[in-house]
């Protein structure tokens, strides 16, 4: 197999929240909102790296369930990856569990932009390789 190297900052995956179990309450340094825990990332990562980072924290890349949640998250952070992508510009936007994503995503006509980002209270398509802040979510 090929060798994988990932550069870890102290604030990155090597935190004590990495293996945190979510037993009815949120781990330290996580935010609680509407029965979910949110990890507010400080480092910029690509969409796929963000996905892995959240998995390592026993959580998922940010998902948006409703407008209120979107407004709440926009106050916390100006932009963040969300767990929504498409397999090409001819395919629908889907969530990580394969369900069609029901909210509108701006700039969807650009074939190179196949991952979604929450940016100031709206959803936009972005280049999956862009380095953007990520947030993780775990439902209690």
């Amino acid at each position: 197999p090929s060798t994988l190297i990932q550069r870890h900052n102290n604030s990155s995956l090597n935190t004590r929240t990495q293996k945190a179990r979510h037993c009815g309450h949120c781990p330290e340094e996580w935010i609680t909102y509407s029965n979910s825990c949110y990890y507010i990332g400080k480092e910029r990562r690509t969409w796929e790296e963000s996905l892995l980072a959240c998995t390592s924290k026993n959580s998922s890349l940010l998902s948006i369930d409703n407008e209120e949640e979107m407004k709440f998250l926009s106050i916390i952070s100006p932009s963040s990856w969300i767990g929504v992508f498409r397999n090409s510009s001819h395919h629908p936007w889907v969530t990580m569990n394969g369900l069609a994503f029901k909210h509108e995503i701006k700039d969807s006509d650009n074939a190179e932009l196949n991952c979604a980002v929450l940016q100031v209270n709206r959803l936009k398509s972005a280049q999956c390789g862009s380095s953007i802040i990520y947030h993780c979510k775990h439902k209690l």
């Epitope: 090929s2 690509t46 796929e48 074939a111 999956c128 390789g129």
Partner: antibody
Amino acid sequence: QVQLVESGGGLVKPGGSLRLSCAASGFTFSDFYMSWIRQAPGKGLEWISYISSSDFTIYYADSVEGRFTISRDNAKNSLFLQMNSLRAEDTAVYYCARRGSLPFNYDMDVWGQGTTVTVSS
Amino acid sequence: DIQMTQSPSSVSASVGDRVTISCRASQGISSYLAWYQHKPGKAPKLLIYAASSLQSGVPSRFSGSGSGTAFTLTISSLQPEDFATYYCQQANSFPLTFGGGTKVEIK
């Protein structure tokens, strides 16, 4: 237009070192994962290394692991391959390539013309 | 590692012929397969991505099919500029691996 131009190839003795560069233009380099691929004389294509746009994730093929180092400078739109402890079997044309835009899909949609590395005494 | 086996290794054909190249993966790779065209001294060119999607700017005579372990590249009507070596590549996981190549030569 979108372009990748490799440089730095040449003749080097076994055990020697060489640093390859790849200059990118016509696209936002900092948004793309990049790879190095090589082709030995009379052989097929061999992927050797990969780096994410954030510089956080790096992969190497077993054949070069521990000897080659991939890096990038997003401010200068440049990709690099530092090659140490070179062997005769490293003789090849080296290509830099840009990963495509689809998540989970590791194809390469833009390639450079290649730079030739010859390892011989 | 995922091994990619291409066949045939070479094919002689005439302009206007239909050419089919096969590629087999040693394990399932879903639709994560790419096809490239490579001419001597030139940059390899992506033709097909995600097994069957035509890359922008590539003529429609090129098509790809298959999923899982068996894939096919078809050139419906061979043109003079199509004489080259074609490679498949599994785009599913690291290390990325290529087929051995198929050289399409003039008959």
